[in-house]
């Protein structure tokens, strides 16, 4: 059970001790469903900077390096929690907010066949 | 600038009003780098339940439905913020924690050639 309002220490503890969080930084370019990363900045939010993935192509890259439209590049999305200043510009009062972010892209078999 | 300790309202505001967070729920099965979702539960954490992706294969699924080892299935990871009860079992005192989660998998061209 969680109360409505709690005290939160913002001195972040990083539990990623056994893994390198930068590890997947080149997947955006090597994937068969490559993506670009776009910076989303909002000073009223914590964290203020979030990187969003946007798939480069509708189709997927085949072995020849060409886009194959028999497959689809799609974003993998995740709901994450962020802190939103409430009221706005408040220095030490926040509200939890759930946002949907695109983390990367994957190549899927299409289920809608409406293109020539 | 953010102070060290803040008040947080846990009554979550959901900004995903224009999107369907379930939309990508079938990608795990349709992807050329399919994955399974595993429940990670921790009562000392908020949110207490996080779903983690586990790639099914070493290689990627080709057009014939077989695993192609000329390509690699890899996890797409993201660092997310969660709240950790501090001290443990505390009802209304938390600390921000950064954890690395696997959100899904993507198919990449290999850079490590150590297999026959």
């Amino acid at each position: 059970n969680f109360p409505r309002t709690v005290m939160v220490n913002l001195n972040i503890h990083n539990r990623n001790t056994n893994t390198n969080p930068k590890r997947s930084s080149d997947y955006y370019d090597r994937s068969t469903s490559p993506w670009n990363l776009h910076r989303n900045e909002d000073p009223e939010r914590y964290p203020s900077v979030i990187w969003e993935a946007k798939c480069r192509h509708l189709g997927c890259i085949n072995a020849d390096g060409n886009v194959d439209y028999h497959m689809n590049s799609v974003p993998i999305q995740q709901e994450i929690l962020v802190l939103r200043r409430e009221p706005p510009h408040s220095p030490n009062s926040f509200r939890l907010e759930k946002i949907l972010v695109s983390v990367g892209c994957t190549c899927v078999t299409p289920i809608v066949h409406h293109v020539a | 600038n953010f102070p060290r300790t803040v008040m947080v309202n846990l009554n979550i505001h959901n900004r995903n009003t224009n999107t369907n967070p379930k939309r990508s729920s079938d990608y795990y099965d349709r992807s050329t780098s399919p994955w399974n979702l595993h429940r990670n539960e921790d009562p000392e954490r908020y949110p207490s339940v996080i779903w983690e992706a586990k790639c099914r294969h070493l290689g990627c699924i080709n057009a014939d439905g077989n695993v192609d080892y000329h390509m690699n299935s890899v996890p797409i990871q993201q660092e997310i913020l969660v709240l950790r009860r501090e001290p443990p079992h505390s009802p209304n005192s938390f600390r921000l924690e950064k954890i690395l989660v696997s959100v899904g998998c993507t198919c990449v061209t290999p850079i490590v050639h150590h297999v026959a």
């Epitope: - | 399974n36 586990k54 294969h57 070493l58 690699n72 890899v74 996890p75 290999p110």
Partner: nanobody
Framework: QVQLVESGGGLVQVGGSLRLSCEVS????????MGWFRQAPEKEREFVAA????????RYAHFVKGRFTISRDNAKNTVHLQMDSLKPEDTAVYYC????????????????WGLGTQVTVSS
């Protein structure tokens, strides 16, 4: 913290067989592949074989292909390496490890190793 305990090594004659086992605990939820590696005296550690926990598909280094077989027991969090037609050049300490990025994992990315199990092939 991941813990890895390898066993099953020993002294064997050329052409003989051994079955190595690796007990794993503390694996991350997202862990999807396990591998066997080996290190001979005065040589660098090298990849031997890999298997995925879910699909069970496996891959091998060219120098063991057709002689070694990797398998896994999901219920017991254990990975095995059946080694047949052993050669003197298979002499090494054998290690298992979690492969967080599957076949994409680089050798310098393993931060922890078990003690390994010694395999000696005598002629």
């Amino acid at each position: 913290q991941v813990q890895l305990v390898e066993s099953g090594g020993g002294l064997v004659q050329v052409g003989g067989s051994l079955r190595l086992s690796c007990e794993v605990s503390g694996l991350p939820v997202s862990s999807y592949a396990m591998g066997w590696f080996r290190q001979a005296p005065e040589k660098e550690r090298e990849f031997v074989a890999a298997i995925s926990w879910i699909g069970g598909d496996s891959r091998y280094a060219h120098f063991v292909k057709g002689r070694f077989t990797i398998s896994r027991d999901n219920a017991k969090n254990t990975v095995h390496l059946q080694m047949d037609s052993l050669k003197p050049e298979d002499t090494a300490v054998y290690y298992c490890n979690d492969m967080p990025y599957g076949l994409d994992t680089r050798m310098d990315e393993y931060e922890y190793w078990g003690l390994g199990t010694q395999v000696t092939v005598s002629s």
